[in-house]
């Protein structure tokens, strides 16, 4: 659904928001999956989205930084394999991820991202359609 | 359909600033987010940045940073982009465009800015 | 910043022709990129999304190919309402466009 692919593609410009300002955020380390096995994608997106990201204080960048993540975490509407998803046992705990600092942490999390829009892409049929 | 109009040409002298205005209609202002690109004369496109019409978020091209401010009015479905400090460099056809899955979908029909003292 | 480069800067061609434009991104992209069409005095029309895929209502002759720096776009056969500029765009990072391809009458 176009709307799904749209918020995957608005996380993406938000992380890459935050990849500019990576030296203001607060450098804890945090889960950041990667190599997600097959149908636990949504699982590890909320992993990313429950993850405690934030800023270091550093004055100026506070505000756009703060704001980026709070937009980062607001859930969207979910679809039927996220439902599904959330409450599969198989899928690994947020905490069995490995821990990586923010800059590692917000590649990581683009990366899904973009798996998961190729992935959608390639269960649409290649014809004329809308982007 | 989706329709995209935008305020008419401007001129103006540097130092000043000015504010663009581009109206919706015919989809869901909030469902989605917009962008702004210019054109400058007989030049390429220029992303410039873009804001989500549903709150204030914005992200902006580094290029403009503290020149750029992007803000919308819900109650009209009306995006606006203002440019400050204005300069010689900055005459271009300014564009808003909405924000698709994918691409920008749908663009404005313009708006000529002209910098002149 | 990722800059894209495109070539050739401009072509002359006639009706019928192939034609075939290209694009470089200075890193890897996947296939984040987009093709627009450009007519003087008019605003840019979206052609092909994510390097391949066909806008609606843009005809088969166009194509698009490509993957991670280097990408195409070819028109099979070139039609009178097809002169104009081409642009290609990334959106792997934010977004950044092509300087531009114009085609024209030979």
């Known amino acids: 659904q176009d709307r799904h692919m749209i918020r995957m593609r608005q996380l993406i410009d938000i992380v890459d928001q935050l990849k500019n300002y990576v030296n203001d955020l607060d450098p804890e380390f945090l889960p950041a999956p990667e190599d997600v096995e097959t149908n636990c994608e949504w699982s590890a997106i909320s992993c990313f989205q429950k993850a405690q990201l934030k800023s270091a204080n550093t004055g100026n960048n506070e505000r756009i930084i703060n704001l980026s993540i709070k937009k980062l975490k607001r859930k969207s509407p979910s679809t039927g394999a996220e439902r599904r998803q959330k409450h599969r046992l198989t899928c690994p705990s947020c905490d069995s991820y490995e821990k990586k600092p923010p800059k590692e942490f917000l590649e990581r999390f683009k990366s899904l991202l973009q798996k998961m829009i190729h992935q959608h892409l390639s269960s649409r049929t290649h014809g004329s359609e809308d982007s | 359909q989706v329709q995209l109009v935008q305020s008419g040409a401007e001129v103006k002298k540097p130092g000043a600033s000015v504010k663009v205005s581009c109206k919706a209609s015919g989809y869901t202002f909030t469902d989605y987010w917009m962008h702004w690109v210019r054109q400058a004369p007989g030049q390429g496109l220029e992303w410039m940045g873009l804001i989500d019409t549903s709150d204030v978020y914005t992200i902006y091209n580094q290029k403009f940073k503290g020149r750029v401010t992007m803000t919308r009015d819900t109650s009209t479905s009306t995006v606006y982009m203002e440019l400050s400090s204005l300069r010689s460099e900055d005459t271009a056809v300014y564009y808003c465009?909405?924000?698709?899955?994918?691409?920008?979908?749908?663009w404005g029909q313009g708006t000529l800015v002209t910098v002149s003292s | 910043d990722i800059q894209m480069t495109q070539s050739p800067s401009s072509l002359s061609a006639s009706v019928g022709d192939r034609v075939t434009i290209t694009c470089r991104a200075s890193?890897?992209?996947?296939?984040?990129l987009n093709w627009y069409q450009q007519k003087p005095g008019k605003a840019p029309k979206l052609l092909i999304y994510y390097t391949s895929r066909l806008h609606s209502g843009v005809p088969s002759r166009f194509s698009g190919s490509g993957s991670g720096t280097d990408f195409t776009l070819t028109i099979s056969s070139l039609q009178p309402e097809d002169f104009a500029t081409y642009y290609c765009q990334q959106f792997h990072t934010l977004r950044t466009f092509g300087g531009g391809t114009k085609v024209e009458i030979k």
């Open positions: 890193q890897d992209i996947s296939n984040y």
């Open positions: 465009a909405r924000y698709g899955p994918l691409a920008m979908d749908y």
